[in-house]
Each structure stands twice: as structure tokens, then as C-alpha cells.
């Protein structure tokens, strides 16, 4: 069975750094392109970035371009989300994902919650 | 980006009757595979989202027929045939042909009492 | 449009080196995917040999890890083979071939351009 | 490793009809619900050229006249109608745990 576990979520001041990590387990990591996709409280559904499945390619929303970097290490099947100079706007719940966008399932983890705050 | 910009923004249903959002993107889905990559997703209350269509018009497996997708180009509809209670939820596109992906701000569905 | 095609001599002798040359046109091999090596024996048996990815990282077939290195040369796009200490059975036709991903960051592990091959024979 | 064994190792199939084309892995292909399983097509002093991937997909290119299903340790190719230029041999390859391997090929003959 396909599992995506987040963890890495809290409180942090703006400014300041902080490294989500998602676990999967179930499926042939290494074989497939995983997402991050955020979610502000209360709001809708913002795609952050993805990762190719042998972390050659990597692309961005324009809103976390040049601060946040998406990596992978496929020997560990975990996904990372290392998010730096934090805004009180990137307040969100954060999921990573897999086959956003093609395939006849998709699979998402249950999210970890980023509050930024002074 | 792509803009995507869904219609209505909230939408009342009396269960069992059909219900209908629409979703047009700023430029066109058609993507250099040959396919139009428009995504809908459901999202129920305190829930992850889940994937309910993809490439316009495929259902996921395991998703009930009452749910179609449609649409071409720019333009794209989710249609509910009959309405049941565990459909509440937001409602969401995504266009999965340009980067940066991008969601239209969603649909809030709900049953009229 | 993506090229392969595998050079190197066509006769070896037994217990030295094999060495194998592919020259990629059409895309970079430091961009992306998995750089292959496979052979087709007489009888037209397949064997994968072995891959280096994008970064320089490889994955061989445990059968051949002793005797087997996948090599690069980023600044003319090519990538190489070294079989040590072959016999008549390494007789066979070289394959190079790359991965096939879609446009999503998925592979499949499947493979979807191959060089012509080239013709190898082991024998003294 | 995994051992893949088609068949038939040979079989001849007239012009419009449909060929069938069996590999059974000694291990499972799948994993997470998706199959690894490729089909590859080749033609005398040619490479092999792929056909069909995760098990049913077919690779850009291939005519609509081949399928691929199958899941776990069955998967199966199917031609039909088989055309003159079909004629080839024809591989399965698995690429769920390494090494990949290659099923030992059949050969298509149109009759």
C-alpha cells in the first residue's frame, strides 16, 4: 500500500528556515516525479514544485522560485522541501504528492502544517 | 502563468440533481504529447484531495460515473449527474501543461436544505 | 531528435579489456535519465548490462559488477564501457540505449532509444 | 534475478489475424500497483525497438493494432490484425527489481 508521510512542520519565525520531509513507502520511489502542494488556512490549493524522478529536473511556483528547493534521496525514499526566508504568507499546510497529473491513481499524504510567525 | 478561473465559487444542490462547474484556463491545455492536461480534483472536509479526472475526460479508478469531465481548449467542465450527500466538499482544476502548474481557486459544493 | 550509436573494435582478445564508446546527439547526458548499456548475445539472448545516470551515479547488473565500469566524458557527450577480463562467452552485440520518462518526471524503466549495436567478438 | 519465459518461442499467424504472445516472470513485475513490464519489437540487423510500456501503455509511434495487458507474473502481447511488417521477434522486459531482464524472445512469422 502506498503511504506518504510529511513531517518537519512548526512554528518559525520570518526570515528563518525550515526542511520538510516526506516518507513514502509502497511504490518504486525512484521511479516517479513527486510534488509539493500547499494549502494557506482556509484557502485553496497552491502547487509548489516538483522534482523529476531522478532529481534532474526540479520546477517552481513563481511565489517560492529562489527561496524554497525541492531535493530527493531515492536511497532513503524521501522527498524534502528545504524552505528558506520565510514569509508569514507561506503559512500553509504542506503535502507532498505523486501522479499529480497523469496515471489512473494519485496519492497524497495527510500534510504537515507550516505556521510562520513573529 | 496560466491562470485558471473556476465558476461558480460556491454552489448550492439539492441531492440527487445534477451540478455543474466550470473552469477556463488563460491559454490553451493542449501540451506537446498530444494531450490537454486539465486535472479536477475533490477535497472533502478535513481531507487531503484526491484526484477525480484526469487529461479532461478520464475518471480515476475507483471514482463514481456520476462524475464527467469535458471541455477543449481553453474551457473545461466538471459535471456531477446526481448529487449525494458524500460529494460535499471544494472543488479544484489544475492545468498540468505549463509550468508552473497552476489551480483554479475552487468550487465550494454543498446541499441545499 | 535523439542519436545513440556505439563504436569501438570489433575483436577483442581473451582476458583483456573490452572498451566501448556511445556518442550521444540530440540531448545532453548530464540533463536527465539513465545511460545504458546492453548486449545481445548469438542466439540474440538480451542482457542489461548496466547504466550511469545524469550526475554521474551508476547501477550495474550484480552479474557483471567486478568486471564492469560505466564511464562519461561530459564535454563530448559521450559514455563509455569497460568489461575486464573477457572470455568468448562476452561475444555479442553492444547495445547503448537511454531510459524513456514522460513529460511528468516518471520513468518507467523501459527503453527508448537504442544505438545500431555493435559487433564484438572474443577470440584469440 | 527475475526470469522471464515467453511463449510461444515461435508462431506463424496469417495476414488480419490476431496474434498472441505470453510472459510469465518467476517474480512479480508489479509494484504499488503499477506494472514494469515493456514489450520490444525487432527486425533482423536492428535494434530492438519498444513498443509498449508499464505492461498496457503504448510508446509513441506504435499503431494502435498492439496491445499489452497483464499484471503480477502474466502479462501478454496481442497483434491484431497482424500486418506483413509485423514480422519480427518480439522481447518482455522487466524493470521492477534490478537487474532488468529480457524475456528469450518469439519470433513472428506472417503467414
Known amino acids: 500500500q502506498v503511504h506518504l508521510v510529511e513531517s518537519g512542520g512548526g512554528v518559525v519565525q520570518p526570515g528563518r528556515s525550515l526542511r520538510l520531509s516526506c516518507a513514502a513507502s509502497g511504490f518504486k520511489f525512484r521511479s516517479y516525479g513527486m510534488h509539493w502542494v500547499r494549502q494557506a488556512p482556509g484557502k485553496g490549493l497552491e502547487w509548489v514544485a516538483i522534482i523529476w524522478y531522478d532529481g534532474s529536473k526540479r520546477y517552481y511556483a513563481d511565489s517560492v522560485k529562489g527561496r524554497f528547493t525541492i531535493s530527493r534521496d531515492n536511497s532513503k525514499n524521501t522527498l524534502y522541501l528545504q524552505m528558506s526566508s520565510l514569509r508569514a504568507e507561506d503559512t500553509a499546510v504542506y503535502y507532498c504528492a505523486r501522479d499529480l497529473i497523469t496515471g489512473t491513481t494519485d496519492y497524497w499524504g495527510q500534510g504537515t502544517l507550516v505556521t510562520v510567525s513573529s | 502563468d496560466v491562470v485558471m478561473t473556476q465558476s461558480p465559487l460556491s454552489l448550492p444542490v439539492t441531492l440527487g440533481q445534477p451540478a455543474s462547474i466550470s473552469c477556463r484556463s488563460s491559454r490553451s491545455l493542449v501540451y506537446s504529447d498530444g494531450n490537454t492536461h486539465l486535472i479536477w480534483f475533490q477535497q472533502r472536509p478535513g481531507q487531503s484531495p484526491r484526484r477525480l479526472i484526469y487529461r479532461v475526460s478520464n475518471r480515476v479508478s475507483g471514482v463514481p460515473d456520476r462524475f464527467s469531465g469535458s471541455g477543449s481548449g481553453t474551457d473545461f467542465t466538471l459535471k456531477i449527474s446526481r448529487v449525494e450527500a458524500e460529494d460535499v466538499g471544494v472543488y479544484y482544476c489544475l492545468q498540468g501543461a505549463h509550468w508552473p502548474y497552476t489551480f483554479g481557486q475552487g468550487t465550494k459544493l454543498e446541499i441545499k436544505r | 531528435d535523439v542519436q545513440l550509436q556505439e563504436s569501438g573494435p570489433g575483436l577483442v582478445k581473451p582476458s583483456q579489456s573490452l572498451s566501448l564508446t556511445c556518442s550521444v546527439t540530440?540531448?545532453?547526458?548530464?540533463?536527465?535519465?539513465?545511460w545504458n548499456w546492453i548486449r545481445q548475445f548469438p542466439g540474440n539472448k538480451l542482457e542489461w548490462m548496466g547504466y550511469i545516470m545524469y550526475d554521474g551515479n551508476n547501477n550495474y547488473n550484480p552479474s557483471l559488477k567486478n568486471r564492469i565500469s560505466i564511464t562519461r566524458d561530459t564535454s563530448k557527450n559521450q559514455f563509455f564501457l569497460k568489461l575486464n577480463s573477457v572470455t568468448t562467452e562476452d561475444t555479442a552485440t553492444y547495445y547503448c540505449?537511454?531510459?524513456?520518462?514522460?513529460?511528468?518526471?516518471?520513468?518507467?524503466?523501459?527503453?527508448?532509444?537504442w544505438g545500431q549495436g555493435t559487433s564484438v567478438t572474443v577470440s584469440s | 534475478d527475475i526470469l522471464l519465459t515467453q511463449s510461444p518461442g515461435s508462431l506463424a499467424v496469417s495476414l488480419g489475424q490476431r496474434a498472441t504472445i505470453s510472459c510469465k516472470a518467476s517474480?512479480?513485475?508489479?509494484?504499488?500497483?503499477?506494472?514494469?513490464m515493456s514489450w520490444y519489437q525487432q527486425k533482423p540487423g536492428q535494434p530492438p525497438k519498444l513498443l509498449i510500456y508499464?505492461?498496457?501503455n503504448l510508446e509513441s509511434g506504435t499503431p494502435a493494432r498492439f496491445s499489452g495487458s497483464g499484471s503480477g507474473t502474466d502479462f501478454t502481447l496481442n497483434i491484431h490484425p497482424v500486418e506483413e511488417e509485423d514480422a519480427a521477434t518480439y522481447y518482455c522486459q522487466q524493470g521492477n527489481e534490478d537487474p532488468w531482464t529480457f524475456g528469450g524472445g518469439t519470433k513472428l512469422e506472417i503467414k
Open positions: 508499464a505492461a498496457s
Open positions: 517474480q512479480s513485475a508489479d509494484y504499488g500497483g503499477d506494472s514494469y
Open positions: 540505449a537511454r531510459n524513456m520518462a514522460d513529460y511528468f518526471g516518471n520513468t518507467y524503466d523501459a527503453l527508448d532509444y
Open positions: 540530440g540531448y545532453s547526458i548530464t540533463s536527465s535519465y539513465y
